[in-house]
């Protein structure tokens, strides 16, 4: 019995289409596939950023695959051909691995790249990123930000930079259509007449960096002799009510501080008839049903009631 063998795929390569980290892995069928004409060949692809402990593995019948990578590091990938037993009339067969790597040749020393990059998607409407210049770079150094997400034909450069002392230290993004729930890729590179500047790459999803506006229209309602209902409204903007969590801070008579986290726009507080003053503030955050992470809003304006006995009336301000 001759042992059946199959070759690895040919021309395996990683192609960078200029999408700042979203790369194409592509290959051609193995040589001498004529023996397996009635056969659906599959490919097992393993890939990772260099330094990562785990490989990502996929099996595909295609000759290409696309995924996002961290271009601050190199990428390594390997692929082999898989034949199920139906192809060989015996046991399953796999080829040896074909391997390839990809990295962007780094320019400049690491200290020249931007520091403390911070991006916030304000109220799920306005993206703003800010950074500090690299360590020890001269004032002639300028940084440029480029971004891409699936849906854009090509990477775009920031058109509205935030400046300090003539240097770009941030970017106000335009309206980003259909940009959430997908990877958002950013590259900040730089130029200087004196020395090369290291590029930095960042990837995140916009729904995970949302900072909402604070809640509005805070009110009190007496529910019973020992209960007061605190109410507020969702902040103006595109974020639906189902996406909010709230944190409340309540102060009674300048002494007792109650904090609570709730999912609705109400909170019922147990009180005593002796309570003379009640104040509360609320802040909001996008919840786990709409994102994996988020940023708390600023606290709302403080709403207080004081003076008259709280049991006497409905409290609205």
């Amino acid at each position: 019995d001759t042992e059946i063998k199959v070759n690895p795929p040919q021309d395996f390569e990683i192609v960078d289409p200029g999408y700042l980290g979203y790369l194409y892995l592509q290959w051609q069928p193995p040589l001498s596939l004529d023996h397996f004409k009635e056969c659906t060949v599959e490919y097992e692809l393993k890939y990772r950023n260099i330094g990562s402990e785990t490989w990502k593995t996929i099996i595909t019948k295609n000759l290409h695959y696309k995924d996002g990578f961290d271009l601050n590091k190199g990428i390594e990938a390997k692929i082999h051909t898989l034949l199920p037993w139906q192809c060989t009339n015996g046991s399953e067969v796999q080829s040896s691995w074909a391997e390839t790597t990809y990295w962007i040749s780094p320019q400049g020393i690491p200290e020249t790249k931007v520091q403390d990059m911070d991006c916030v998607y304000y109220n799920w409407q306005y993206l703003l990123c800010s950074w500090k210049p690299g360590i020890g770079v001269l004032l002639d150094t300028n940084y440029n930000l480029f971004y891409w997400y699936e849906g854009l034909d090509h990477a775009l450069q920031c058109v509205d930079y935030i400046k300090a002392d003539g240097q770009n230290i941030g970017c106000r993004f335009p309206y980003l259509e259909a940009s959430d729930y997908k990877d958002f890729y950013i590259c900040v590179n730089g130029s200087s007449e004196n020395k090369p500047i290291r590029s930095s790459y960042f990837t995140f999803q916009l729904q995970n960096i949302v900072k909402p506006l604070p809640p509005v229209y805070l009110t009190f309602t007496r529910e019973s002799s020992c209960e007061i209902k605190l109410k507020w409204s969702i902040p103006l903007g595109p974020i639906p009510a189902r996406c909010f969590d709230y944190e409340i801070e309540i102060r009674e008579d300048d002494t007792t501080l109650v904090t609570a986290t709730v999912e609705n726009e109400t909170y019922t507080l147990k009180t005593t008839n002796e309570t003379r003053q009640l104040c509360f503030v609320v802040r909001s955050k996008v919840n786990i049903y709409c994102s994996d992470d988020g940023i708390w809003s600023e606290w709302s304006d403080k709403q207080c009631w004081e003076g008259e006995d709280l049991s006497k009336k409905t409290l609205l301000r």
């Epitope: 659906t40 599959e42 097992e44 593995t57 996929i58 099996i59 595909t60 019948k61 295609n62 695959y65 898989l82 199920p84 037993w85 139906q86 046991s91 399953e92 796999q94």
Partner: antibody, heavy 121, light 108 residues
Amino acid sequence: EVQLLESGGGLVQPGGSLRLSCAASGFTFSRYAMNWVRQAPGKGLEWVSAISASGGGTYYADSVKGRFTISRDNSKNTLYLQMNSLRAEDTAVYYCAKVRYGWGAGAFDYWGQGTLVTVSS
Amino acid sequence: DIQMTQSPSTLSASVGDRVTITCRASQSISSWLAWYQQKPGKAPKLLIYDASSLESGVPSRFSGSGSGTEFTLTISSLQPDDFATYYCQQYDTYPPITFGQGTKVEIK
């Protein structure tokens, strides 16, 4: 006649473990890739894991990776799913399924009757 | 991951009707698509594989078509035994294997 018979389901507390088995008959078990698919009460089908015919290739859904382990014993015609660190959201009917053609997964031409796993305190 | 979207979610029809269920993939999956029928309390049953191949023993009133991202399952003349939930499934690239959310065919 092809038959797949799951067993090992039951009630388990969050954080607990279970081992599901699927006894296969009526076909050459060692030649076919096998999979586990689950269905939460009143919900759709969710793929869980796949294993190649020899057992050399194993593949998992992100939701179970690191917690579940698929294996097979071709001498016993049996497929296994070891489930650790179980969560409430793992509550479902678990089906084993035979792959019609392919290395690890594909169209599933035969399914077991399912075994119910309930994760609750 | 490849997302599979079925429409409609529920379909009301009468015996003898021609019924069409659509499945859309978020990216091209060539013809690597299967259709299943599931009745309450039972395991799914393979109807169609490779987008258009009829599984052995399945009545010829079931047919599948499409390639790339758009696929359809057609029941040419609905029979009483056909009231069930139908799922599409891609096996072009995995993990994960992904299913559509299901289409329930109920009696009008």
